[in-house]
Interface confidence: medium
């Protein structure tokens, strides 16, 4: 056997090149036939009336033909024949790749609540072979479940992703990425997650700066509440007691002028939105005026309905009047 061919893989719409090569030429006739065994070229003559076939090279050792605007119907075995005695035949297989026509991502709901599991679907339509779909949340790869539908040698792939959302996922893209031999580079589509979550509440002491609260001093606390949607209600209450008469509430701020021992207690900032409610507590201890040496601690405790972490701010009075603040996780 001294007649050789090579298999051809081509993307739909592009050009396929078919080559019949003879190793030891003796000027025998070379012929190329299509999958229906119709003659495309006999020597340099084209009996088949399909102008998409063009002669690239004809000699005693090679018949090279191009097929332009390849379609899926062109797929199959093409036969090279060499009229020696006995005749020789070799075939080349043309495989046509079809990139996905359309890539669609569909998210079950536009807005999800933290902790909720949502379904995201991605469909790559009418490709050949079937597309591989990969999922990413940000740059983290996730595993979906794919189903393949075949119709007339073409494949539609639908991949389903079940995703449990967290507040950190708000604004993060969910990306459906396609891998296909007919696609170079990244073919992808994405949707951004919108996650609603209950408030996170944090109390900050804005005055006194050194953190030590003494009789006669003023106290200013600021309540920061972050949630989605942004909390509409931020309220200050005194736990198990009435708010002091001389306390002033201004939005997220609590002012208490001229502190005295009767102000000792727990002050709570509460915030809520449509998802839920959370609070943070500040334990106020009013120390004697500077003439006496103070006990060592003023504490702030942060609690929410979602976490067991308690943040305690400890004022360390070993450095004299200047207290240093340490954050301690319990």
């Amino acid at each position: 056997q001294n007649l050789f061919t090579k298999d051809v893989t081509v993307i739909e719409g592009e050009v396929a090149t078919i080559s019949c090569q003879v190793n030891k030429s003796d000027d025998s006739v070379i012929q190329l036939l299509n999958p229906n065994r119709q003659t495309i070229y006999f020597r340099d003559f084209r009996p088949l009336k399909d102008s998409r076939f063009q002669l690239l090279n004809f000699s005693s050792s090679e018949l090279k033909v191009s097929l332009t605007n390849v379609s899926i119907s062109d797929e199959g075995r093409y036969f090279c024949q060499l009229y020696t005695d006995p005749p020789q035949e070799s075939y080349t297989t043309i495989t046509v790749l079809v990139p996905p026509r359309n890539l669609m991502i569909d998210i079950q709901k536009d807005t999800a609540v933290e902790g909720e599991e949502i379904e995201v679907n991605c469909t790559a339509m009418a490709s050949k072979p079937a597309t591989t779909i990969r999922w990413f949340k940000g740059n983290t790869e996730l595993k979906g479940k794919s189903e393949v539908e075949e119709w007339s040698d073409m494949y539609t792939v639908t991949s389903q992703l079940m995703l449990k959302v967290h507040k950190e996922d708000d604004g993060v893209p969910v990306i459906c990425q396609v891998e296909h031999p007919a696609v170079t580079g990244n073919l992808q589509t994405q949707r951004y997650l919108e996650v609603q979550y209950k408030p996170q509440v944090h109390i900050q002491m804005t005055y006194p700066l050194q953190g030590l609260t003494r009789e006669g001093d003023a106290l200013e606390l600021t309540c920061e509440a972050i949630g989605k949607p942004q909390p509409v209600m931020v309220t200050w209450v005194r736990v198990d007691d009435e708010m002091p008469q001389h306390a002033v509430l201004s939005g997220p701020n609590l002012f208490i002028n001229n502190l005295n021992k009767t102000d000792n207690g727990t002050y709570r900032c509460e915030a809520s939105n449509i998802v839920g409610k959370a609070h943070s507590d500040y334990m106020l201890y009013v120390y004697d005026p500077p003439t006496t040496i103070p006990p060592p601690t003023t504490t702030t405790t942060t609690t929410t309905t979602t976490t067991t972490t308690i943040l305690t701010i400890i004022t360390d009075s070993r450095a004299g009047e200047e207290g240093s603040i340490r954050a301690v996780d319990h």
């Epitope: 940000g138 983290t140 595993k143 992703l161």
Partner: antibody, heavy 125, light 107 residues
Framework: QITLKESGPTLVKPTQTLTLTCTFS??????????VGWIRQPPGKALEWLAL???????RYSPSLKSRLTITKDTSKNQVVLTMTNMDPVDTATYYC?????????????????WGQGTLVTVSS | DIQMTQSPSSLSASVGDRVTITCRAS??????LAWYQQKPEKAPKSLIY???SLQSGVPSRFSGSGSGTDFTLTISNLQPEDFATYYC?????????FGGGTKVEIK
């Protein structure tokens, strides 16, 4: 208790195909979320991930070796088979199979626990 | 591919020491990192997953921390059985990749 054991030839000639079998117990490869991976370690060198097969027959391969690797599963026999074509002396290594651990079924990320004892494959003529 | 770089490649320590091994990813991997311990002629054993979660049955002297690109494995009170090679592995995305290993030897 999950256990895995690798079996296959200890000596392979260059250009030959290596076929390794991982036989496991304590879990089923038809259970959602389950997967089995293959990792190798050349003598005195680091670990290298090769391939992984999921319960739903989804297969993932190391890109640098993808053209040479095939991973398959036989759920009824509790076995996973790895074949590696065109073996070369640089493929001499201990080959491990391992059970895929995962926090959530949907997460593609994997770590492995436990591992099989490993099988040393030497490629030499 | 995400490259995982471990340091140091080897270290000498004594029983009772506190040992720290670091692992750096070439790009952010969130908290998708596992740590393994491997003793000579044995298979690796999982210690830590999700950067800081202790695998069941692993002593509490092992701890992991970090997120993004920089991670740490700490052994707080080194025991004789802890002398081994330690590997990190990212599972943020394919291909799964391992660090080059850190060998902990007796001083």
């Amino acid at each position: 208790q999950i256990t895995l054991k690798e079996s296959g030839p200890t000596l392979v000639k260059p250009t030959q195909t290596l076929t390794l079998t991982c036989t496991f117990s304590g879990f089923s490869l038809s259970t959602s979320g389950v997967g089995v991976g293959w990792i190798r370690q050349p003598p005195g060198k680091a670990l290298e991930w090769l391939a992984l097969i999921y319960w739903d027959d989804d297969k993932r391969y190391s890109p640098s070796l993808k053209s040479r690797l095939t991973i398959t599963k036989d759920t009824s026999k509790n076995q996973v088979v790895l074949t590696m074509t065109n073996m070369d002396p640089v493929d001499t290594a201990t080959y491990y199979c391992a059970h895929r651990r995962v926090e959530w079924v949907t997460l593609a990320g994997n770590w492995f626990d436990p591992w099989g004892q490993g099988t040393l494959v030497t490629v030499s003529s | 591919d995400i490259q995982m770089t471990q340091s140091p490649s080897s270290l000498s320590a004594s029983v009772g020491d506190r040992v720290t091994i670091t692992c750096r990813a070439s790009q952010g991997i969130s908290s998708w990192l596992a740590w393994y311990q491997q003793k000579p002629e044995k298979a690796p054993k999982s210690l830590i997953y999700a950067a800081s979660s202790l695998q069941s049955g692993v002593p509490s002297r092992f701890s992991g921390s970090g997120s993004g690109t920089d991670f740490t494995l700490t052994i707080s009170n080194l025991q004789p059985e802890d002398f081994a090679t330690y590997y990190c592995q990212q599972y943020n995305s394919y291909p799964l990749t391992f660090g080059g290993g850190t060998k902990v030897e007796i001083k």
